[in-house]
């Protein structure tokens, strides 16, 4: 898969492949994988991809199931790239406060907050 | 501030305090703080709170500006708690796939994806 495929298209294709290979993936009934308790997914990307690694090592490879895991590794690469962009640019306090305000605003309206 | 205050109320109050103390906070014109390039805020919580720490160390404390930084540290505590919950529960592959599907679905519809 060329990494030039837009990430949004990659995510869509991966969702489809996940449905296709569901039966094969759940074949191992004894396998247990950490699953986050909440739905703030972005906080848990490390654990999600560790889980994918565990699943891959337990899944018989071949055909399009390989494509599924290849896609997932490209998505991980994209997320790692985004994480790098968290701290690369040093800006003035003014911009930092605008960003902090946006972050808290998003937290206020979109996060799934359990008290 | 009692930690019993619901996190959602804490976030709202913090947003208000941020507006109130803006002028004081931007007083240091030479200070530079990392600001993420993208808006996938949850991926950048570590950098955001490091930035808050830098800002706090450079800000004259006293009055309600202390309450602002106290609130922000409680929000950090909440997020750290959420991060702990990412890997606590070991579940069957079925549940992990449900979570992965939800994660990719959110990525597909809500993430800010630049190719």
């Amino acid at each position: 898969i060329p990494t030039e495929i837009p990430t949004s298209a990659l995510v869509k294709e991966t969702l489809a492949l996940l449905s296709t290979h569901r039966t094969l993936l759940i074949a191992n009934e004894t396998l247990r994988i950490p699953v986050p308790v909440h739905k703030n997914h972005q906080l848990c990307t490390e654990e999600i991809f560790q889980g994918i690694g565990t699943l891959e090592s337990q899944t018989v490879q071949g055909g399009t199931v390989e494509r599924l895991f290849k896609n997932l590794s490209l998505i991980k690469k994209y997320i790692d790239g985004q994480k790098k962009k968290c701290g690369e640019e040093r800006r003035r306090v003014n911009q930092f406060l605008d960003y902090l305000q946006a972050f808290l605003g998003v937290m206020n309206t979109e996060w799934i907050i359990e008290s | 501030i009692p930690t019993e205050i619901p996190t959602s109320a804490l976030v709202k109050e913090t947003l208000a305090l941020l507006s109130t103390h803006r002028t004081l906070l931007i007083a240091n014109e030479t200070l530079r703080i990392p600001v993420p390039v993208h808006k996938n805020h949850q991926l950048c919580t570590e950098e955001i709170f490091q930035g808050i720490g830098t800002l706090e160390s450079q800000t004259v404390q006293g009055g309600t500006v202390e309450r602002l930084f106290k609130n922000l540290s409680l929000i950090k505590k909440y997020i750290d708690g959420q991060k702990k919950k990412c890997g606590e529960e070991r579940r069957r592959v079925n549940q992990f796939l449900d979570y992965l599907q939800a994660f990719l679905g959110v990525m597909n519809t809500e993430w800010i994806i630049e190719s």
């Epitope: 040093r90 800006r91 003035r92 003014n94 911009q95 605008d98 960003y99 305000q101 946006a102 605003g105 998003v106 309206t109 | 530079r32 600001v35 993420p36 390039v37 993208h38 808006k39 800010i112 630049e114």
Partner: antibody, heavy 119, light 107 residues
Framework: QVQLVQSGAEVKKPGASVKVSCKAS????????INWVRQAPGQGLEWIGY????????RYNQKFKGRATLTVDKSTSTAYMELSSLRSEDTAVYYC????????????WGQGTLVTVSS | DIQMTQSPSSLSASVGDRVTITCKAS??????LSWIQQKPGKAPKTLIH???RLIDGVPSRFSGSGSGQDFTLTISSLQPEDFATYYC?????????FGQGTKVEIK
């Protein structure tokens, strides 16, 4: 492709208000700040302010604070710039421009809207 | 506000010439500077950001350099389509401010 399409030219009387629109297409509207810049005839460029469509937060050049109002309509992916108490020196071409990241460079510009203030 | 001083305000050059435009900020703006091209009656177009990063699709004859307070835009070999006005923009702090422009005319 990514595009910002602005509303047509306007002629206004001094003291009136004008509202210029900027319709975004080809990308997710809430992902990028929209900046507004103006250019008086034969003059340079001047930044008015920006709005973050994600949370409606706007920041203004002090020079325009109180007279300029930046808003967005997320349902139509449209940004608006309203300028009140118009005077002849507000005669200019008004541009919207998309911010590539957070407080980053302007990667896409609208075609501009000429606002003429004349009695 | 940060003042951006561009020089020269205009210049005459021939096709194939190497052209250099400078921009000086009144204070340190790190590398948060972009160069913008504007042709008569047209919308501006950003050529370079972060002082020296060429935007996709912009010809490689354009280059930028500098950091802190002093910045330069260079056109290595002027082409007919390059005759325009060029502006620098600092986006380091609010309000963002532009240089007054440099008009590049045909000699």
């Amino acid at each position: 492709q990514v595009q910002l399409v602005q509303s047509g030219a306007e002629v206004k009387k001094p003291g009136a208000s004008v509202k210029v629109s900027c319709k975004a297409s080809g990308y997710t509207f809430t992902n990028h700040h929209i900046n507004w810049v103006r250019q008086a005839p034969g003059q340079g460029l001047e930044w008015i302010g920006y709005i973050n469509p994600y949370n409606d937060y706007s920041r203004y050049n002090q020079k325009f604070k109180g007279r300029a109002t930046l808003t967005v309509d997320k349902s139509t992916s449209t940004a608006y710039m309203e300028l009140s108490s118009l005077r002849s020196e507000d005669t200019a071409v008004y541009y919207c421009a998309r911010d590539y990241g957070n407080f980053w460079y302007f990667d896409v510009w609208g075609q501009g809207t000429l606002v003429t203030v004349s009695s | 506000d940060i003042q951006m001083t561009q020089s020269p305000s205009s210049l005459s050059a021939s096709v194939g010439d190497r052209v250099t435009i400078t921009c000086k900020a009144s204070q340190d703006i790190n590398s948060y500077l972009s160069w913008i091209q504007q042709k008569p009656g047209k919308a501006p177009k950003t050529l370079i950001h972060r002082a020296d990063r060429l935007i996709d699709g912009v010809p490689s004859r354009f280059s930028g350099s500098g950091s802190g307070q002093d910045f330069t835009l260079t056109i290595s070999s002027l082409q007919p389509e390059d005759f325009a006005t060029y502006y620098c923009l600092q986006y380091d702090d609010f309000p963002y401010t532009f240089g007054q422009g440099t008009k590049v005319e045909i000699k």
